[in-house]
């Protein structure tokens, strides 16, 4: 069964700078990745970025830079808001649309005990959504 993992990382140098890393574990080719915050895409969440493996990126504040890291993983740098740990209690969700598997989505957030520079373990937190 395909899985999606989500890591939320606070930069060691800037406590208000965060990066979301997401990856897809499974066969098939990815056709689109959607990153949202505050909940899953289309279920109360607000879209932060859409990444297409050929056509590029669309992103919305506070996203600063969305990019592909590998063929099956992406990263999303979030804008420094000036506040200390502004995204500490926020849930980030990544939805991978793949062929022929369909859509798989998982969510994650920065662990409360995280030290700067550390990240959430790459354990998928599935929200039983496979379209």
């Amino acid at each position: 069964t395909p899985e999606v993992w989500v890591q939320v990382q606070m930069e060691a140098t800037e406590l208000s700078s965060f990066t979301v890393h997401c990856g897809f574990l499974g066969p098939g080719s990815i056709s689109l990745v959607t990153v949202s915050w505050g909940g899953p895409d289309g279920a109360g969440g607000t879209k932060l970025a859409v990444l297409h493996p050929e056509l590029g990126t669309r992103q919305w504040a506070p996203a600063r830079q969305a990019r592909w890291e590998t063929q099956s993983s992406i990263s999303l740098a979030l804008e420094d808001s000036g506040a200390s740990s502004p995204f500490a209690n926020t849930t980030f969700c990544c939805k991978f649309a793949s062929f022929p598997e369909g859509s798989w989505e998982s969510c994650g957030s920065l662990p409360p005990s995280s030290d700067p520079g550390l990240s959430a373990p790459p354990t998928p937190v599935p929200i039983l959504r496979a379209d």
């Epitope: 056509l55 992103q59 830079q65 990019r67």
Partner: antibody
Amino acid sequence: EVQLQQSGPELVKPGSSMKISCKASGYTFTDYSMDWVKQSHGKSLEWIGAINPNNGGTSYNQKFKDKATLTVDRSSSTAYMELRSLTSEDSAVYYCARWDSDYWYFDVWATGTTVTVSS
Amino acid sequence: DIVMTQSQKFMSTSVGDRVSITCKASQNVRTAVDWYQQKPGQSPKALIYSASNRHTGVPDRFTGSGSGTDFTLTISNVQSEDLADYFCLQHWNYPYTFGGGTKLEIK
């Protein structure tokens, strides 16, 4: 017919602010995000930023982050771009353009608004 | 930022000729490149999206090709109404960036 109608030319003084409007018609305004592009006289095009009319979410080219503010009024299907602290460098034609999120390109462009900054 | 280089600022051609306008990206942008045409005194108009797909209503004498870093807009059987500036655009990464433009002149 899909149309984007921009406000007319503006002559403004250095240091002032101004707002350009872009009224959409012929389609559902909230289904497409709106981008803004600058074209200085005789020069190329520069992407300023985009706004999602659905939720007001914005994205800016860092170069224009302190210069432009994008907003929308869903009730009138109009997008706005406010430009502040204007200098002669801001004299240009500004375009709004509709982003087709299915095919990933600017499929419709407005006629443009000429802004001249002069004392 | 990704730099899109259109090395030919001006190109001169004759009616009926075939002309190729090139655009080079400073890094791999897959097929996230469009071409826009701007006739004198007008706003830009979409020609080609996703490197090789024609926008609705664009004559088939306009062809886009390329992927990665090198892209080409080819106009076969050039017509007098093709006199315009042509711009490429990348939307692979933010900020989106345009090429400097190529002005097509008709002899």
